[in-house]
């Protein structure tokens, strides 16, 4: 796996341990927590990043209305089970044998149950809505400049193909970034929208996962854009299954 050869580090994931023990003395990096080898030329999967995080020491209406099936990650951090490819396993359980089903971004999509709970497949999150509110500025940002800059950022920093940035909506001070990626659209080597959204979320919080690349510095025509709150909604290819009790 490619990593910075000279000092053997992983530019795309600081939560790794790297050593020149790959084939031919090449730098190889393994994710903390899981010990899985990671490809440092692309983003690391959210599942492996969450696992690494848990292993680390504690320290006129143009805006989109999320559908009734949109999920928000209210459960927060947990130590996930990842498959050999680094994806979330469909069923996650905690140490007290409480289990639940998750989608491809690791967000719970069913009520919690016991060890008998079945999660037949990992349901893909095909639409992510990132809702940002920026700090007050002298004037509104130009919408097309903002759109172009966010697309550039997702392409360069998160390596997400521009076709997966479906839209950028703007009603000062709210910015919404829509990411869409169906199973059929995602080719081998394409960054997953869930991974890109997670890196972006961590960047926005000032917790960059990149190494040697500085924090997120978002600017539109040279004007810094500072985000003061973020909400992320996840829409799955199959709607989630929660009991009515949760919905009331």
């Amino acid at each position: 796996h490619t990593a910075a050869q000279d000092n053997c580090t992983c530019p795309t994931n600081k939560m790794t341990v790297c050593s020149p023990d790959g084939p031919g003395g090449r730098c190889q990096c393994r994710a903390l927590g899981s010990g899985m080898a990671v490809d440092c030329s692309t983003l690391t999967s959210k599942c492996l990043l969450l696992k690494a995080r848990m292993s680390a020491p504690k320290n006129a209406r143009t805006l989109v209305r999320p559908s009734e099936h949109a999920l928000v990650d209210n459960d927060g951090l947990y130590d996930p089970d990842c498959d050999p490819e680094g994806r979330f396993k469909a069923r996650q359980c905690n140490q007290t044998s409480v289990c639940w089903c998750v989608n491809s971004v690791g967000v719970r999509r069913t009520d919690k149950g016991d060890l008998s709970l079945r999660c037949d497949e990992l349901v893909r999150t095909h639409h992510i809505l990132i809702d940002l509110r920026h700090r007050p500025t002298a004037g509104a940002f130009n919408h097309s400049d903002l759109d172009a800059e966010l697309r550039r950022l997702f392409r360069e920093r998160y390596r997400l193909h521009p076709k997966f940035v479906a839209a950028v909506h703007y009603e000062q001070p709210t910015i919404q970034i829509e990411l869409r990626q169906n199973t059929s659209q995602k080719a081998a080597g394409d960054v997953d929208i869930g991974d890109a959204a997670y890196y972006f979320e961590r960047d926005i919080k000032g917790e960059s996962l990149f190494q040697g690349r500085g924090g997120l510095d978002l600017r539109v025509r040279g004007e810094p854009l500072q985000v003061e709150r973020t909400l992320i909604y996840y829409l799955d290819e199959i709607p989630p299954k929660f009991s009515m009790k949760r919905l009331t």
Epitope: R157, G214, D217
Partner: antibody, heavy 121, light 107 residues
């Protein structure tokens, strides 16, 4: 308009130190990083390091560590490059250049006019 | 460190010619590559950033492309003022590095 104005040419003896200044105007100093690049006579461009003017944290190229100090005075919107233990190979034009604070903006959109530092006994 | 290898190191062309300069990174740098033009005795000027984004005020005859490790700067129709030295630079990770330069001369 956005401008970076550097201090004048310097002639130094081997072993001495030099301090080059770069005064920024036309924008809010702390919203952009300041990079330093040098160019030896007839040679290419060599990155020396940069400073995040917002946090005040500098980062240096490995070849210059221990010899270079990059600093910034936000009250005067001025960045400084100090190079010590000068050798004849340090004879070059030294440029300051503006960039963003994150890697997606580590390209240099505005440059100073350059400061020629000559090291000669 | 990431090495940026530019080719050719020098190039002779005529006004009106289409010219392509290439830059190869020693490892994947996404689209984090910039191109500069430098004339004798002057500071470099930014032409392209993020591989393909033309900087404000740069004529449309200049274009950039590429991602990963291979990048190109194209001048579609050379003008007399375009004869200069051109440098690529990655802006992916520190340390930042430049290509060795391509000198574009009049044939």
């Amino acid at each position: 308009q956005v401008q970076l104005v550097q201090s004048g040419a310097e002639v130094k003896k081997p072993g001495a130190s030099v301090k080059v200044s770069c005064k920024a105007s036309g924008y809010t100093f702390t919203t952009a990083g300041m990079q330093w690049v040098r160019q030896a006579p007839g040679q290419g461009l060599e990155w020396m390091g940069w400073i995040n003017t917002h946090s005040g944290v500098p980062k240096y190229a490995e070849d210059f560590k221990g010899r270079v100090t990059i600093s910034a005075d936000t009250s005067t919107s001025t960045a400084y490059l100090q190079l010590s233990s000068l050798k004849s190979e340090d004879t070059a034009v030294y440029y300051c250049a503006r960039s963003g604070h994150g890697s997606s903006y580590w390209y240099f959109d505005v440059w100073g006019q350059g400061t020629l530092v000559t090291v000669s006994s | 460190d990431i090495q940026m290898t530019q080719s050719p190191s020098s190039l002779s062309a005529s006004v009106g010619d289409r010219v392509t300069i290439t830059c190869k990174a020693s490892q994947d740098v996404s689209t984090a590559v910039a191109w500069y033009q430098q004339k004798p005795g002057k500071a470099p000027k930014l032409l392209i950033y993020s591989a393909s984004y033309r900087y404000t005020g740069v004529p449309s005859r200049f274009s950039g492309s590429g991602s990963g490790t291979d990048f190109t700067l194209t001048i579609s129709s050379l003008q007399p003022e375009d004869f200069a030295v051109y440098y690529c630079q990655h802006h992916y990770i520190t340390p930042l590095t430049f290509g060795q330069g391509t000198k574009l001369e009049i044939k």
